[in-house]
């Protein structure tokens, strides 16, 4: 015959632990149940009775399986400079990510404690090292021969155009300029020309508030500002 | 046009540490950031972290982490590349490499060569 | 991580011919893909970065193309000195991974 299948609560037998989804209760001397996530212990097992549970309530969550007498509360509602990408349920707490243009500067367990704004790179430098979730844009000079006259948070310094004849040689924050004759680009052919405004609004060592208005696609700007360093090394 | 000259080769034995300069010339250290790639003979190129010397800040490779240290001298804008507990497997060639605001790695040094060998 | 792999491992071809080397990342890496050279005893260097920039002094016959996860390096006309090993790297995510590399050799 099977060994006969205990039904909580019951004595477990010296030296055994309890089975999945259940916790031996120190008082009672007994295996017991456990609450479901979204659950918590309302009322203790005894010798003869088992755990009783009851739904969390509003603005508060268990994750796992449990035996606490309250669940736990939900973090504060996200802050401006963040998005909400999971909500509180009874299950789950909420978890707050920073938005476009802003880097966690303080993690949490989940989420994000505190952001900050991704640093701009002012005119004559570009990003070395596009921001992450979790790190900020590393600005550097722009080497020579290649420029950006933006100030922002994703573009990258690019060729100056190479001229037959140069009315203006390129700098670090300015393109070359051409007489009339045609000049070339060193840029590969088919590349996407999408003009966008010029800002100065930062020093490339002072961040500024406002989000990174960078493109999400994969085009390449060669004869606007500098085309954006798209995307970002994550971590 | 910024020049990246590297120390010179060097024979370690198993379980020593092995540290490698990389001097930087005709432009300041803190323009770049300076990258270590490790590149094995005959096999293709590992990238082993960065250094930003402007504000020492490092990243590094998980492979790498546990053993690798990367650190800046700005007042002789010199880079180095210290790599323990050194194995056979580590015998390769080492370049740094300087990235500036072209996001890309613009210069690399001559590269230095480790043989690990008991 | 991501992998990044090129194709062929060696191209045979002539020179004054076109070539096409292909690499293709494991994921969406946008266009944060460079390309770099090594000649046999040399360091890398690079000629095409964030997929189609070429780098400042590098002859126009390098082209760089593509985003997201396919990407080719093209030399128009092969001069006796583009025989070399020719690797792709992506930047979009750490760690930093370059590609086996192809070799480009002569016919």
């Known amino acids: 015959l099977p060994a006969q299948v205990a039904f909580t609560p019951y004595a477990p037998e010296p030296g055994s632990t309890c089975r999945l989804r259940e916790y031996y209760d120190q008082t009672a001397q007994m295996c017991c149940s456990k609450c479901s996530p979204g659950q918590h212990a309302k009322v203790f097992c005894t010798k003869t009775s088992d755990t009783v549970c009851d739904s969390c309530e509003d603005s508060t969550y268990t994750q796992l399986w449990n035996w606490v007498p309250e669940c736990l509360s939900c973090g504060s509602r996200c802050s401006s400079d963040q998005v909400e990408t999971q909500a509180c349920t009874r299950e789950q707490n909420r978890i707050c990510t920073c938005r476009p243009g802003w880097y966690c500067a303080l993690s949490k367990q989940e989420g994000c404690r505190l952001c900050a704004p991704l640093r701009k790179c002012r005119p004559g430098f570009g990003v070395a090292r596009p921001g992450t979730e979790t790190s900020d844009v590393v600005c550097k000079p722009c080497a020579p021969g290649t420029f950006s006259n933006t100030t922002s948070s994703t573009d990258i310094c690019r060729p100056h155009q190479i001229c037959n004849v140069v009315a203006i040689p390129g700098n670090a924050s300015m393109d070359a300029v051409c007489t009339s004759t045609s000049p070339t680009r060193s840029m590969a052919p088919g590349a996407v020309h999408l003009p966008q405004p010029v800002s100065t609004r930062s020093q490339h060592t002072q961040p500024t508030p406002e989000p990174s208005t960078a493109p999400s696609t994969s085009f390449l700007l060669p004869m606007g500002p500098s085309p954006p360093a798209e995307g970002s090394t994550g971590d | 046009e910024v020049q990246l000259v590297q120390s010179g080769a060097e024979v370690k034995k198993p379980g020593a540490t092995v540290k490698i300069s990389c001097k930087v010339s005709?432009?300041?250290?803190?323009?770049?950031?300076l990258h270590w790639v490790q590149q094995a003979p005959g096999k293709g190129l590992e990238w082993m972290g960065w250094?930003?010397?402007?504000?020492?800040?490092?990243k590094y490779g998980q492979k790498f982490q546990s053993r690798v240290t990367i650190t800046a001298d700005t007042s002789t804008d010199t880079a180095y590349m210290e790599l323990s507990s050194l194995r056979s497997e580590d015998t390769a060639v080492y370049y740094c490499?300087?990235?500036?605001?072209?996001?890309?790695?613009?210069?690399w040094g001559q590269g230095t060569l480790v043989t690990v060998s008991s | 991580d991501i992998v990044m792999t090129q194709s062929p491992a060696t191209l045979s071809v002539s020179p004054g011919e076109r070539a096409t080397l292909s690499c293709k990342a494991s994921?969406?890496?946008?266009?944060?893909v460079d390309w770099y050279q090594q000649k046999p005893g040399q360091s890398p260097r690079v000629l095409i970065y964030?997929?189609?920039i070429r780098y400042t002094g590098i002859p126009a016959r390098f082209s760089g193309s593509g985003s997201g996860t396919e990407f080719t390096l093209t030399i128009s006309i092969l001069q006796s000195e583009d025989f070399a090993v020719y690797f792709c790297?992506?930047?979009?995510?750490?760690?930093?991974?370059f590609g086996q590399g192809t070799k480009l050799e002569i016919k």
């Open positions: 490499a300087a990235n500036s605001g072209t996001g890309t790695m613009d210069a």
């Open positions: 964030k997929a189609s």
């Open positions: 994921q969406n890496v946008g266009s944060n």
């Open positions: 250094i930003d010397p402007e504000e020492g800040k490092t």
């Open positions: 790297m992506q930047s979009k995510s750490y760690p930093i991974t």
């Open positions: 005709g432009y300041s250290i803190t323009d770049y950031l």
